[in-house]
């Protein structure tokens, strides 16, 4: 028996359902009584879901997995993972045994988009050219960790005096806070781009300082 899976990682958004595709080519006369199907975590060998002795043995993994029972006889051994969490990310191995056996691994990549950044300025009044200001760009509830880029009004990257920190909450999602310290010119726009490297999603925030008032 030959097992086939997608070579590309399956990308799933947090809280959505994902299908990890796995298939085999059944011989003529194949019946489910002959099938032993096991899904497990590749690295830890933890059992995720199994079909043995002619029946679905159910989920061994937080009761959020399911097979496609009506399609098994056609060779579809795919696994449905419901309400995806950050902790589900990783490699899953599909083992199929009929008379001989084969296995293949498929990667699940979890992602969550970042919120539109909020911008704060310190100090936020009585600003004059030559003043040192701290601009903070904050974006929330994304995964995996973000790349953060700062640019001035002309699109020139600002790389000096940038400190970026990531905070993971209980669900494993990141809040990113990036701080730019800059000396004010006569006026200027400072923009922050928060990029999710998996989704290639960019979230933008900017602040324009024109004497007074401030524009966010």
């Amino acid at each position: 028996v030959e097992v086939q899976v997608s070579e590309d990682p399956v990308v799933a958004l947090v809280d959505t359902d994902a299908t990890l595709r796995c298939s085999f080519s059944p011989e003529p006369g194949f019946s489910l009584a002959q099938l032993n199907l096991i899904w497990q975590l590749t690295d830890t060998k933890q059992l995720v879901h199994s079909f043995t002795e002619g029946r679905d043995q159910g989920s061994a993994y937080s009761n959020r997995t399911a097979l496609f029972p009506d399609l098994l006889v056609q060779g579809n051994a795919s696994l449905r993972l419901q309400r995806v969490r950050v902790t589900d990310e990783g490699s899953y191995t599909c083992f199929v045994s009929i008379q001989d056996f084969d296995s293949a691994a498929v990667s699940l990549q979890v992602a969550a988009p970042y919120s539109k950044p909020s911008m704060t300025l310190e100090p936020n009044k009585d600003l004059r050219p030559g003043n040192m200001v701290t601009i903070t760009c904050s974006s929330y509830q994304g995964y995996p960790e973000a790349e953060v880029f700062w640019k001035d009004g002309q699109g020139v990257p600002l790389t000096g005096n940038v400190t970026t920190s990531q905070m993971a909450n209980e669900r494993g999602l990141f809040d990113v806070h990036s701080v730019l310290r800059v000396v004010l010119g006569a006026n200027g726009t400072y923009s922050c781009l928060v990029r999710n490297p998996v989704l290639q999603q960019d979230a933008h925030g900017s602040v324009t300082i024109t004497g007074q008032p401030l524009t966010f």
Partner: antibody, heavy 121, light 108 residues
Framework: DVQLVESGGGVVRPGESLRLSCAAS????????MNWVRQAPGEGLEWVSR?????????YYADSVKGRFTISRDNSKNTLYLQMNSLRAEDTAVYYC?????????????WGLGTLVTVSS | EIVLTQSPGNLSLSPGERATLSCRAS??????LGWYQQKPGQAPRLLIY???TRATGIPDRFSGSGSGTEFALTISSLQSEDFAVYYC??????????FGGGTKVEIK
Amino acid sequence: DVQLVESGGGVVRPGESLRLSCAASGFTFSNYAMNWVRQAPGEGLEWVSRINYKGYNITYYADSVKGRFTISRDNSKNTLYLQMNSLRAEDTAVYYCAKSGSNSNNFFDYWGLGTLVTVSS
Amino acid sequence: EIVLTQSPGNLSLSPGERATLSCRASQSVGSQLGWYQQKPGQAPRLLIYGASTRATGIPDRFSGSGSGTEFALTISSLQSEDFAVYYCQQYYDWPPLTFGGGTKVEIK
């Protein structure tokens, strides 16, 4: 079994460079963030650097090494690297390679045995 | 940077006794805290993550508790192999990922 094996340590003079390697096995290397943690003789643990998983190449450094050290990984070789330039006496330590337990929780569930770097004139 | 302060610095106890180690964070780290054991000449070993979850293969005499800024590692009945240095580490707000200064548990 997960194994992390560091190499490349040695004795160098201040200002010189050294490249550490960490060969990983027993897990899907590309799926995990990796770190370097060091321990000066008789002292506590100090996190040095982290590189996130896959090929996204997002890196972080302790202030004490920023601009001098570069972390990188070769997922095809299951190997983590630390390029150390402009070494100082205070960089003398055992350098451990450590695997992040998950990509959102940066505890270190597996460690190598370490490689000793001595910076001395 | 979040600073972790461990106390006491040294703890002298006899085998069979209960050990309680403390770790205090300079600001809340939620439950994003780990505990490690290190013996002389060896690499650290993960004991606890998520403040209270035992790592794979860790005996149940080790338990972690706390959240926010106050954490504890308890060894219910010290075995000879438990005499070592213990470190806490936060992974809530980073970089940097920070460790406490360590508590040395030694035989009385």
